[in-house]
Interface confidence: medium
C-alpha cells in the first residue's frame, strides 16, 4: 500500500481467483483514543471500533472511502483504490491502446518545436468518474523539472457504437535548451483513477523524436507568364523554433489531381518556394519536416490550382 | 578552416558535408534492424558517446560570441564516432551489406573532422576510451544504438554549420 495523495491510498493486488489479497491497517487521524467506529462509503454498518481498523483487501467491494467517527462526528477519511496486477502485469483497462507507433502505446506525445513544450494525449471509452494526474521529468535517476498542466477533455468521437474521449495535457521543460543534443529522455507519468480503480501509464521519449512542425503558412501560387507552371511560395510556421538559419526545415511539395488514383508529382526542397506544373482541378500541398533529423512531417497545407 | 588560434572554418563546405552526414546517418539506420531503443530498458545509458550539451556554445548566441568552443566539441564527437564506425562493432561479423552507407558515413566523418582541423593543428581531443572488443551477438544492437545517437549528434552539428554559413561566413 502507498499514498497517492493526502488520505488516498493505493493497494496493489495480485489479481487471480482465490488470491489472498492484502492486509491493510488503517489508522484514524485523531488524538482521540476511545469510542471510535469505522464505516465504508455511505453505509452506516459499523465495520470495527478502535483507533485502527485491520481489513483484508481482496476485491473492489473492499475498496472505497473508510471513515472513522466518534459520537456522530467524522474524524478522518481514508480512500482506498485498487491497482490490479494479473500475471505480473499491471492492468491497463482505463486507457485505449492507440497501437501507433507500436502496440501498447497508451500515451502519444508531440512537440511543435524545440522549446521544451510538448503535448500528450490519450483515449478512453469511459465518460464518468474519471480523473487524471500528470507528472513529468527529464531523466529518472536525477530528474530535471518539467511542469505539466491539468489534463483536459480535448475531443469526443463516435467510433461505431462507442463514444471515444480524448484527453490531453501540455507540459513545458523548466530549463529547456533547444540547441543541445538530448542525452536523457523526457519521462511522462499519468495516474488514472476510474471509480476505485487506479492505473498508471508512462512514456519515455526525446523531444527530437516527437517533433511535428505545424504546416507551412501563407501558401500562395503565382502563375508564370506563358506557361502552365506556377511558382508556389510559403513561409515557416509561426510556431517553429527560431532562428530559421539554425532550426531549418525541409519541404515536400505535392501536386494532387481530384482523383486519389491520379499520379502525384512530388518535389523536395529546402527553399520556401518551388516551381510546379498546375493541372486543371488539381491542388498543391506543402508539408514540412526538420531538415536534419527525420521526425514526423507536418500536416499538409493546401491550395487549389484554379 | 578552423585553427586553434580561432579563425573561421569553411562554413559552407562544413554545412554541405554535415548535411550529407545527416542523410547518410538516416540511410544507414534501417540496415541495422528495426529495434526500438526504448524496449531495451536503458534510455539513460548513453554515456558511452559524447553529446553536444547546453554549455558547449553551440546555440546561435554562443556561436556569435565564440564559435571555437562549439567547433572543438563537434570535432571531438566526429573523431569519437569515426573511431566507433572503424571499430570491430562495424567491421566485424555479422558483416554489413556490401553497399551499406556505413563506409561512406565513416569517410564523411573523417572528412568533416579534417575540415575542422587540418593536418598540423591540434585541438585538445577528448580522451576516447579504449573500445572493449565487441562480440558478434552485441554488434547489431550496438550498431543500432550508435547510429541512433549519431543521428542526433550530426543534426546539431548540421544546424551549427547551416547557421554559421548563413550568418558567420566572411
Amino acid at each position: 500500500i502507498w499514498e497517492l495523495k493526502k488520505d488516498v491510498y493505493v493497494v496493489e493486488l495480485d489479481w487471480y481467483p482465490d488470491a489472498p489479497g492484502e492486509m491493510v491497517v488503517l489508522t484514524c487521524d485523531t488524538p482521540e483514543e476511545d469510542g471510535i467506529t469505522w464505516t465504508l462509503d455511505q453505509s452506516s454498518e459499523v465495520l470495527g471500533s478502535g483507533k485502527t481498523l485491520t481489513i483484508q483487501v481482496k476485491e473492489f467491494g473492499d475498496a472505497g472511502q473508510y471513515t472513522c467517527h466518534k459520537g456522530g462526528e467524522v474524524l478522518s477519511h481514508s480512500l482506498l483504490l485498487l491497482h490490479k496486477k494479473e500475471d505480473g502485469i499491471w492492468s491497463t483497462d482505463i486507457l485505449k491502446d492507440q497501437k501507433e507507433p507500436k502496440n501498447k502505446t497508451f500515451l502519444r506525445c508531440e512537440a511543435k518545436n524545440y522549446s521544451g513544450r510538448f503535448t500528450c494525449w490519450w483515449l478512453t471509452t469511459i465518460s464518468t468518474d474519471l480523473t487524471f494526474s500528470v507528472k513529468s521529468s527529464r531523466g529518472s535517476s536525477d530528474p530535471q523539472g518539467v511542469t505539466c498542466g491539468a489534463a483536459t477533455l480535448s475531443a469526443e468521437r463516435v467510433r461505431g457504437d462507442n463514444k471515444e474521449y480524448e484527453y490531453s495535457v501540455e507540459c513545458q521543460e523548466d530549463s529547456a535548451c533547444p540547441a543541445a543534443e538530448e542525452s536523457l529522455p523526457i519521462e511522462v507519468m499519468v495516474d488514472a483513477v476510474h471509480k476505485l480503480k487506479y492505473e498508471n501509464y508512462t512514456s519515455s521519449f526525446f523531444i527530437r523524436d516527437i517533433i511535428k512542425p505545424d504546416p507551412p503558412k501563407n501558401l500562395q501560387l503565382k502563375p508564370l507568364k506563358n506557361s502552365r507552371q506556377v511558382e508556389v511560395s510559403w513561409e515557416y510556421p509561426d510556431t517553429w523554433s527560431t532562428p530559421h538559419s539554425y532550426f531549418s526545415l525541409t519541404f515536400c511539395v505535392q501536386v494532387q489531381g481530384k482523383s486519389k488514383r491520379e499520379k502525384k508529382d512530388r518535389v523536395f526542397t529546402d527553399k520556401t518556394s518551388a516551381t510546379v506544373i498546375c493541372r486543371k482541378n488539381a491542388s498543391i500541398s506543402v508539408r514540412a519536416q526538420d531538415r536534419y533529423y527525420s521526425s514526423s512531417w507536418s500536416e499538409w497545407a493546401s491550395v487549389p490550382c484554379s | 578552416r578552423a585553427v586553434p588560434g580561432g579563425s573561421s572554418p569553411a562554413w559552407t563546405q562544413c554545412q554541405q558535408l554535415s548535411q550529407k552526414l545527416c542523410t547518410l546517418a538516416w540511410s544507414a539506420h534501417p540496415l541495422v534492424g528495426h529495434m526500438d531503443l526504448r524496449e531495451e530498458g536503458d534510455e539513460e545509458t548513453t554515456n558511452d558517446v559524447p553529446h553536444i550539451q547546453c554549455g558547449d556554445g553551440c546555440d546561435p548566441q554562443g556561436l556569435r560570441d565564440n564559435s571555437q568552443f562549439c567547433l572543438q566539441r563537434i570535432h571531438q564527437g566526429l573523431i569519437f564516432y569515426e573511431k566507433l564506425l572503424g571499430s570491430d562493432i562495424f567491421t566485424g561479423e555479422p558483416s554489413l551489406l556490401p553497399d551499406s552507407p556505413v563506409g561512406q558515413l565513416h569517410a564523411s566523418l573523417l572528412g568533416l573532422s579534417q575540415l575542422l582541423q587540418p593536418e598540423g593543428h591540434h585541438w585538445e581531443t577528448q580522451q576516447i576510451p579504449s573500445l572493449s572488443p565487441s562480440q558478434p551477438w552485441q554488434r547489431l544492437l550496438l550498431r543500432f544504438k550508435i547510429l541512433r545517437s549519431l543521428q542526433a549528434f550530426v543534426a546539431v552539428a548540421a544546424r551549427v554549420f547551416a547557421h554559421g554559413a548563413a550568418t558567420l561566413s566572411p
Epitope: - | T45, T46, N47, D48, S132, W137
Partner: antibody, heavy 118, light 106 residues
C-alpha cells in the same frame, strides 16, 4: 584469483521485486563485459542480461526485457540485476559471470537462488 | 534467436573411454561457440571457446572442433571427475545455450 560473489536472492511473491548484487575481485572489473545467466531447477542454462564495460550499453533476453535492469558500479567492482514484476518462470539460480572477449563466460560465481512463489 | 541442439541427451561411458558430444546450431555461428562443464551443485566451468581453444587450466584430454553449424567436444579418456553435464553456447547472435548432454558412468 578471479572471484565473483552473488547475493540478494531469496523468496518473493509473484509481481514482486528483488535486486541481486555480484561483488567482483581479482581482475580489472571496469575492462570486462559482465553478464547474468540463470538456471531453473533441474533445467539448462539461460542467458539473462549483459552489460558493456562502462555500463553505457546493456543487453537483455526477450524473456526479461522491460522487467529486469542490469547495471554496474565500477568504483565498487559490483554488478547488479534489478528484477521487477517477477513471475513463477523467473525462479532459478542466478549466476554472475565475466564475459571474455570471445563471448564466452570465462568465470562464474556460485549463484544465488531466487524463489518466486505465493 | 539461434537454436542450439545437443546430442545425445545422455551418454553412458566407462572411465578411460573416449566421449564424443555433438552440438548443432540452427544457422551458422562461424566459430563463435563455447563448451562448459557443470558438476552437480556447482557453477558451470568454461572448457573451450572459439570452437577449439582450450580455456586456462583445462586438461589436454578436452578438445573442441567444428565450424558453422556442427561442433564436437571430445574427451579422449574420461576421468571420474569428468562425469557431469556439458553445455554448448553460441555467441554469434543473442547468446543461447544448448539443452546439455549428461555424461554418466556406464
Amino acid at each position: 584469483e578471479v572471484q565473483l560473489l552473488e547475493s540478494g536472492g531469496g523468496l518473493v511473491q509473484p509481481g514482486g521485486s528483488l535486486r541481486l548484487s555480484c561483488a567482483a575481485s581479482g581482475f580489472t572489473f571496469s575492462k570486462y563485459n559482465m553478464g547474468w545467466v540463470r538456471q531453473a531447477p533441474g533445467k539448462g542454462l539461460e542467458w539473462v542480461s549483459g552489460i558493456w564495460p562502462s555500463g553505457g550499453w546493456t543487453f537483455y533476453a526477450d524473456s526479461v526485457k522491460g522487467r529486469f535492469t542490469i547495471s554496474r558500479d565500477n568504483s565498487k567492482n559490483t554488478l547488479y540485476l534489478q528484477m521487477n514484476s517477477l513471475r513463477a518462470e523467473d525462479m532459478a539460480v542466478y549466476y554472475c559471470a565475466r564475459v571474455s572477449e570471445y563471448g564466452s563466460f570465462d568465470y562464474w560465481g556460485q549463484g544465488t537462488l531466487v524463489t518466486v512463489s505465493s | 534467436d539461434i537454436q542450439m541442439t545437443q546430442s545425445p541427451g545422455t551418454l553412458s561411458v566407462s572411465p578411460g573411454e573416449r566421449a564424443t558430444l555433438s552440438c548443432r546450431a540452427s544457422q551458422s555461428v562461424s566459430n563463435n561457440l563455447a563448451w562448459y562443464q557443470q558438476r552437480p551443485g556447482q557453477a558451470p566451468r568454461l572448457l573451450i571457446y572459439s570452437a577449439s581453444t582450450r580455456a586456462t587450466g583445462i586438461p589436454a584430454r578436452f578438445s573442441g572442433s567444428g565450424s558453422g553449424t556442427e561442433f564436437t567436444l571430445t574427451i579422449s579418456s574420461l576421468q571420474s571427475e569428468d562425469f557431469a553435464i556439458y553445455y554448448c553456447q553460441q555467441s554469434y547472435s543473442t547468446l543461447t545455450f544448448g539443452p546439455g548432454t549428461k555424461v554418466d558412468i556406464k
